[in-house]
Amino acid sequence: MMCLECASAAAGGAEEEEADAERRRRRRGAQRGAGGSGCCGARGAGGAGVSAAGDEVQTLSGSVRRAPTGPPGTPGTPGCAATAKGPGAQQPKPASLGRGRGAAAAILSLGNVLNYLDRYTVAGVLLDAQQHFGVKDRGAGLLQSVFICSFMVAAPIFGYLGDRFNRKVILSCGIFFWSAVTFSSSFIPQQYFWLLVLSRGLVGIGEASYSTIAPTIIGDLFTKNTRTLMLSVFYFAIPLGSGLGYITGSSVKQAAGDWHWALRVSPVLGMITGTLILILVPATKRGHADQLGDQLKARTSWLRDMKALIRNRSYVFSSLATSAVSFATGALGMWIPLYLHRAQVVQKTAETCNSPPCGAKDSLIFGAITCFTGFLGVVTGAGATRWCRLKTQRADPLVCAVGMLGSAIFICLIFVAAKSSIVGAYICIFVGETLLFSNWAITADILMYVVIPTRRATAVALQSFTSHLLGDAGSPYLIGFISDLIRQSTKDSPLWEFLSLGYALMLCPFVVVLGGMFFLATALFFVSDRARAEQQVNQLAMPPASVKV
């Protein structure tokens, strides 16, 4: 499961960047097409990747026809803030710059692979680390909590910084930071468990910087389908990095004969990547690819950004829905392998586990299924949304809602199937997770549509914070608590060990249904919130005197 834990954050950060920037780019193209007349030109937009006003917006999950919008007095055309000689005017980029941007995206994607490789290398050797430090389960829980909490707290901070300061410097510093911390943590003496806890917290901070900021840079480097491709590559790095992390952890541990060496691989690669980011990633302006970079000067305070986001109903409801996904994935990832092991004990196809880790084989199968459904879910969701957009403007949240509600059914069926068939349970897990993960890219699209460019990093960060806080930060413990509560009132037997955990896990489909409801609520406000965001972008493109955000 873990390989997908933060994918929504990365997808959100990446994909949400795309549509608004697309609109900005088209607007600037329209300005350039006006040929310096000082008004909004009627001619087609000039330059690659730039389309005219009423054209369709290319996003990761397809394209949607945009209703023509513009400031008063220019119906049917985008806002036009500058003449061809004004601050928005740019010359077409030479091909070499295209290659440079490709290299930059590749480096950022590699960084994302390393980000997750590092996280799951630690996950891969966690049992060894626990054994070495004499960590009890409550201590392991503390390690998990400290990581998630520090990630949660740091994300909004980096969101704020990412909307205001040099992103590639913050990014590189973040990579250097977590690399140094991870490398140092491989030398922590056995008696200093608290240092291990501190190091996990610090790594959470470092990784929060990457997850929050990197996608927004990619969003500002590319246009249209190219950006779609680059963003896809960027967040497909998550399951890839996670899988490589487990592989790296176990193989380096075996080769070196000491688990400590596993923690020294990703930091070395991280330092190299951090340096490459500094060298190869251009210091793009926000909205650069849309050729609005110089015009997006309007800066609002963090408090104002937060107020605007909290008032944005589509954003709030989709964030709550994302929390429901996070709740379910966190709980299922933690407990499903053990639940399936207990199911096999009840079916007498496995022995009671007295020496943990229990259900190691089930963990492996579940991990593989989760990683694959991560890929499949994104593709399915994107395809379904592309098709549904031909039918309705509310396609994005509606596809998410259907995916969630369908997922809830199959998650419920896991507990029915597990009693008699483990294979059946795995099939239900496969379908349930595919549907659950199908809303990743779309949720990102929703955020991108309804949030203006200058507060996107903050929006991604706040969504990441919320989804961890209400989702996977507490769900594994809540399920464990409910299971123990049920078990206390029943007789001690393998059957009740299995049933109590199953009953506790039944909370997940209910939360997923709740998430589906939140997506339906998003659908109610989506069109109006998207229109409002477009109007604000148009205002941002005006000369400073007329800007009101």
């Epitope: 004499g134 009890k136 056995q190 020496s355």
Partner: antibody
Framework: EVQLVETGGGLVRPGSSLKLSCATS????????MSWVRQAPGKGLEWVAL??????????NYAESIKGRFTISRDDSKSRVYLQMNTLRDQDTATYYC????????????????WGQGVMVTVSS | DIVLTQSPPTLSVTPGESVSLSCRAS??????IHWYQQRSNESPRLLIK???QSIAGIPSRFSGSGSGTDFILSINRVESEDFSVYYC?????????FGPGTKLEVK
Amino acid sequence: EVQLVETGGGLVRPGSSLKLSCATSGFTFSDTWMSWVRQAPGKGLEWVALIKDKNSNSEANYAESIKGRFTISRDDSKSRVYLQMNTLRDQDTATYYCTRHEDFYYYSGYYFDYWGQGVMVTVSS
Amino acid sequence: DIVLTQSPPTLSVTPGESVSLSCRASQGISTSIHWYQQRSNESPRLLIKYASQSIAGIPSRFSGSGSGTDFILSINRVESEDFSVYYCQQTYSLPLTFGPGTKLEVK
């Protein structure tokens, strides 16, 4: 005051079984990891088995020389730790010490901060 | 398994002298070494934990040092009650192992 008192030792024949018991007091037993360490006559110390607390699923670890023959267990309600010894061999003859690992709530030290007085187990035909 | 070697096996000293007992590990074990004292017909007792950390109730004349593979237990001005066997133990990885011991005897 921390106290560890071992009982159950004696003279047994090779191949037979014996169960050692260690009664504890003076500390929160349920949170503490416990081990058995033995010492053959005139020889050095040898760690035998370790049992973790309930918060660590009472996971047990064993020395290779006794794996599959000895079983460590605990009863938190009685604050006792046990060592069930099956298929005893001549080389199992030793003084068996019940030991406590220092506890730090979130983690535990693998060293032994308190030792019992020891109980003699003699395996001979 | 990590093998611990203690030297010398026996050390003869006169009371009031200062001594150093050595413990060498077969591989690097950071500071995961602990020292025990076992007097004749008694149970062992913990003297030093994690190579150099002192234990409450243990006289300050006992001190430890070292990291990696080489460790030292130092006794500053040996007293009569110190004549006993000293064991080092590693906790870097399971199985937990002890050194063969160093016997400190009166010269």
